[in-house]
């Protein structure tokens, strides 16, 4: 049935679905912090601009009784229950902001019109690439993915003169939802990943992947996983590593490696961090003074979502256009906006811009140091530290086949 | 297109310090590092240091170090260059511009005429 | 980091080919790809014309072409024209992440 937006005559409402199942444990509350204070942002932006305006965000709750995993398990059903909340209600806002798993968008955006635009703090897997009317405000597979081809290819920085062509990576199926896609993106055979890799081998077993730290016979020195150092820990403990192995540990949204007072741990010697580039202190920000420095990302998407729908309203008031019009719903990518932190690009597609990094440990200060940036916007890496206190010979990452001479 | 603009001249004393602005107008100031270089009078150019403006990471010329900081204002995409103790050999024109690729400025401001002069 | 050795000046007829040298050692030219090449006009803002040893940047003429054997890097114009008339600068990375420049290079076209 047709369901009436509320969006017009001065009065713009946003649609919050507030989903149990979602990419991340964040009490619902924190997130509705995270509205509240972008709503207040938004009015002030409007006001400023002359723009005389209501904006309010109606949150909707599924029930919670059937779907309670907590985790992205039942979050299709529970966010086709939601859309049918809606749809009952008859009553939608001019932009639907939610769901985060990547299993409730997929099936929520092939069952919805494409009349109003849908914002994710999450829906990481490739499955929610290219879609027309959906943006995401957390790194997709995809630039993971972009960075790591990018990344083995690289052979003309002072430390890292080999192409790579090879990779292992580790996936035992506990991982977090963000991990889960991303490594989902790496293992799938026909992702832009798998096509660039002469050889590529998935690790199921904690076994497998202690097995190759030392096998003499193994296919590639380099070894991908997704999580924190704990969780490296928990499978690697302090067993021997040979000295030619680069592990790259995925962990993007944890700003705790570039903490004053941090000291990498004797495990982290032969790893190298991916993660993101810090955002400025939201320490003193009301939203987020509950928040794990590892939670913050998903509850500022949120606040930034908002921010984002405050900006493309100011855009289309300021040009006198229809705000419940295809138009309005396609038009949330390729742009700049002001974000909580500072400036956020979205891609053609809708997906955050971000500028990754990687980190390595220093042997001399036992202190993770930035080796070198990489901007997804524009696909490319700017090495940082061209002269790194590597573990590694000659402070050079090793080639990813042993015994292979200059490539 | 990324520019960077940059104030025309400033007049100092010996003695004094000189604090050079560099705001990218047209973009932000990305995960490149901003380079400062100077030129004095008829002179080549001479390397003093960079930042990576996303991390607030620096690395000074060892000519330099101890009297120059650089440092980046993310929300306001502008990086500044302060040099102290300035004597009379200071005078120049300070360029501030982007690395696109180390040791590789492909966008340049227009520079800034510091005159240190009693 | 001491500046990088160049000829003071040289110079060429229109049509002509000159090659200006930049001369390091294996700490900075020798060591790295991350070799570049400026032109300056007079009062006016350096110019990029090649990075990593021999890449233009989109918009530079193919007139200009980088090589590098050993220590010594090479700024080649070829055709020379008037408007080629500048100071000319190398630059190369210098180990523990400094940069240096040359010592400039003028050119006249005769």
């Known amino acids: 049935s047709q369901v009436s937006q509320n969006c017009h005559n001065g009065s713009y409402e946003i649609s919050v679905l507030m989903m149990g199942n979602s990419a991340f444990a964040e009490p619902l509350k924190n997130l509705e912090d995270a509205v509240n204070e972008g709503l207040e942002i938004v009015r002030g932006r409007l006001q400023n601009a002359g723009l005389n305006v209501t904006v309010n965000a109606t949150f909707m709750y599924s029930d919670g009784l059937i779907h309670n995993s907590g985790d992205c398990r039942s979050s299709t059903c529970e966010g086709l229950d939601l859309l049918r909340k809606i749809s009952n209600a008859q009553r939608m806002g001019c932009v639907l902001i939610g769901p985060s798993c990547t299993y409730s968008t997929f099936q929520m955006y092939l069952d919805t019109e494409l009349s109003y635009p849908m914002i994710s703090a999450g829906s990481f897997g490739l499955s929610c690439d290219y879609k027309e009317t959906l943006t995401r405000l957390m790194s997709p597979a995809r630039k993971l993915m972009y960075f790591l081809v990018n990344f083995w290819k690289t052979n003309d920085l002072p430390f890292k003169t080999y192409s790579w062509s090879t990779s292992y990576v580790y996936k035992n199926g506990t991982e977090t939802e963000d991990c889960f896609w991303y490594l989902n993106a790496l293992e799938a055979s026909v992702s832009y990943f798998s096509h660039e890799l002469g050889f590529k081998v998935v690790l199921r077993q904690d076994k497998e992947f202690q097995d190759i730290l030392m096998d003499h016979n193994r296919k590639s020195n380099v070894i991908i996983m997704c999580g924190g150092p704990e969780f490296l820990y928990k499978l690697k403990g302090d067993r021997a590593v040979a000295e030619d192995i680069v592990i790259i540990l995925v962990d993007l949204f944890n700003d705790q490696y570039f903490e004053d007072n941090v000291t990498a741990p004797d495990y982290m010697k032969n790893v190298l961090v991916l993660t993101l580039s810090p955002g400025n202190s939201l320490l003193n920000s009301s939203f987020s003074r509950n928040l794990s420095p590892t939670k913050r990302d998903f509850a500022l998407a949120y606040l930034n979502g908002i921010l984002l729908f405050g900006h493309m309203l100011k855009i289309f008031l300021e040009n006198g256009e229809n705000i419940t019009t295809p138009k309005f719903a396609h038009a949330f990518r390729n742009l700049t906006f002001e974000g909580y932190d500072g400036p956020v690009t979205l891609d053609d597609w809708g997906d955050v811009d971000s500028t990754m990094v990687l980190l390595y440990t220093s042997v001399d200060t036992k202190k993770y140091k930035v080796l070198l940036t990489y901007d997804t916007h524009v696909n490319k890496t700017y090495p940082v530290d061209m002269s790194p206190t590597f573990t590694w010979k000659n402070s050079k990452l090793p080639n990813d086949i042993t015994g292979r001479g200059p490539q | 297109e990324v520019q960077l603009v940059q104030p025309g001249a400033e007049v100092k004393k010996p003695g004094s310090s000189v604090k050079v602005s560099c705001k990218a107008s047209?973009?932000?100031?990305?995960?490149?590092?901003i380079s400062w270089v100077r030129q004095a009078p008829g002179q080549g150019l001479e390397w003093m240091g960079r930042?990576?403006?996303?991390?607030?990471?620096?690395n000074y010329a060892q000519k330099f170090q101890g009297r120059v900081t650089i440092t980046a204002d993310k929300s306001t995409s502008t990086a500044y260059m302060e040099l102290s103790s300035l004597r009379s050999e200071d005078t120049a024109v300070y360029f501030c511009?982007?690395?696109?690729?180390?040791?590789?400025?492909?966008?340049w401001g227009q520079g800034t005429l510091v005159t240190v002069s009693s | 980091q001491s500046e990088l050795t160049q000829p003071a000046s040289v110079s060429g007829s229109p049509g002509q080919s000159i090659t200006i040298s930049c001369t390091g050692t294996?700490?900075?030219?020798?060591?790295?790809?991350?070799v570049s090449w400026y032109q300056q006009h007079p009062g006016k803002v350096p110019k990029l014309m090649i990075h990593?040893?021999?890449h233009r940047p989109s918009g530079v003429s193919n007139r200009f072409s980088g090589s590098r054997s050993g220590n010594t890097a090479s700024l080649t114009i070829s055709g020379l024209q008037a408007e080629d008339e500048a100071d000319y600068f190398c630059?190369?990375?210098?180990?523990?992440?400094?940069?240096?420049f040359g010592t400039g290079t003028k050119v006249t076209v005769l």
């Open positions: 990593d040893v021999s």
């Open positions: 047209g973009g932000t100031l990305s995960s490149y590092a």
């Open positions: 511009a982007r690395d696109q690729r180390p040791a590789s400025m492909d966008v």
């Open positions: 930042i990576i403006p996303i991390l607030g990471i620096t």
């Open positions: 630059s190369s990375y210098a180990g523990s992440n400094n940069y240096v």
């Open positions: 294996s700490s900075d030219v020798g060591g790295y790809i991350y």
